[in-house]
């Protein structure tokens, strides 16, 4: 789903404040809910019908370092019998999402939201179209 | 998929560097990839043989402000005949994403990272149990 | 975290009737299953019905199947068990819970769970 444009004022100081120094805000370090863990159904990607295989990128600089991407296995789903089923799609599920970008010039660091695309996993569906057209 | 702690180094400065003042950190202004936006196939909640709805939540003080959570529709998948096939489970997905929570006292105002859960879709999976156990 | 409040349980005759409430709050915005559990004395807990949400289809357990219809009020986060031709071996303590992976749900998943209501079918 779609994050906003921060262009808005969530990240301003109420108009009758004085405004931000040099372009920065302050950060309190520690993350709420940071023991909030995903716990899903064992082995979703390879018993669904629209399967996918997960990789993982890593970026030292990035939080989280270590960002997992699903890539569908299939253009088609997986019928009962294992077979594809090349009359639906496999699709992916993508998600926008956050993570903070870490960057220093000796002492002196900051850090900076970035958003980043993840698709998440896969599902199947009935064709809009069989073709290109 | 899983955001590591954050109780690591990835906050703090090295350790040659004097340490950063009141627990909290510079957090530039303004998001790399703004523009980047989630272009997924037209529908997929409703053509999905793992059907979903979304619902949308919203906090002023959250940055995004929506955050939309999916909902599986059915507890098994809708078979070509548009028919439930209870043989078959719909499953959620769900993603570990961050968000940005403002917190203000007048004009002094700090932001915090926060993680949440979000149900991105659903997927049908061939089931491990027929029925709780 | 949920709060399950049971209610509505009661000493019946064999082949009588009986409905039991659930109220729900607390639930995560994407929750998407509730169910209906029970637990004789001396025995596992085990599975009855489940009941989605958004599409309002229901499971159930062979041994109550016909017998019992599961229900939900969306609005009111309150679900429903109806349960007809009671026998003797229905007794038990039923519980309601969140079924956050709908019918792959484990038991081991439950962090916690309500006080329950007790049912007693007398022959």
């Known amino acids: 789903r779609k994050i906003p444009k921060v262009g808005h004022t969530f990240f301003q100081k109420p108009e009758s404040c004085p405004p931000v120094p040099g372009g920065s805000m302050k950060l309190d370090i520690g993350i709420i809910n940071e023991n909030q863990r995903v716990s899903m159904s064992r082995n979703i990607e390879s018993r669904s019908t629209s399967p996918w295989n997960y990789t993982v990128t890593w970026d030292p600089n990035r939080y989280p370092s270590e960002v997992v991407q699903a890539q569908c296995r299939n253009l088609g789903c997986i019928n009962a019998q294992g077979k594809e089923d090349i009359s639906m799609n496999s699709v992916p599920i993508q998600q926008e999402t956050l993570v903070v970008r870490r960057k220093h010039q000796g002492c002196s660091v900051s850090f900076q939201l970035e958003k980043v695309l993840v698709t998440v996993g896969c599902t199947c569906v009935t064709p809009v179209i069989h073709h290109v057209q | 998929r899983k955001i590591p702690k954050v109780g690591h180094t990835f906050f703090q400065k090295p350790e040659s560097c004097p340490p950063v003042p009141g627990g909290s950190m510079k957090l530039d202004i303004g998001i790399i990839n703004e523009n980047q936006r989630v272009s997924m196939s037209r529908n997929i909640e409703s053509r999905s043989t793992s059907p979903w709805n979304y619902t949308v939540t919203w906090d002023p003080n959250r940055y995004p402000s929506e955050v939309v959570q999916a909902q599986c529709r059915n507890l098994g998948c809708i078979n070509a005949q548009g028919k439930e096939d209870i043989s078959m489970n719909s499953v959620p997905i769900q993603q570990e994403t961050l968000v940005v929570r403002r917190k203000h006292q007048g004009c002094s105002v700090s932001f915090q990272l926060e993680k949440v859960l979000v149900t991105v879709g659903c997927t049908c999976v061939t089931p491990v149990i027929h029925h709780v156990q | 975290q949920v709060q399950l409040v049971e209610s509505g349980g009661d000493l019946v005759q064999a082949g009588g009737s009986l409905r039991l409430s659930c109220s729900v709050s607390?639930?995560?915005?994407?929750?998407?299953?509730m169910g209906w559990f029970r637990q004789a004395p001396g025995k596992e807990r085990e599975f009855v019905a489940a009941?989605?949400?958004?599409?309002?289809?229901?499971r159930y357990a062979d041994s109550v199947k016909g017998r019992f219809t599961m229900s939900r009020d969306n609005a009111k986060k309150q679900v429903y068990l109806e349960m007809n031709s009671l026998k003797p071996e229905d007794t038990a303590v039923y519980y309601c819970n969140d079924m956050p992976y709908g019918m792959e749900t484990r038991m081991d998943d439950y962090a916690s769970w309500g006080q329950g209501t007790q049912v007693t079918v007398s022959s």
């Open positions: 009941i989605s949400w958004v599409g309002g289809d229901t």
């Open positions: 607390g639930l995560r915005v994407s929750s998407y299953a």
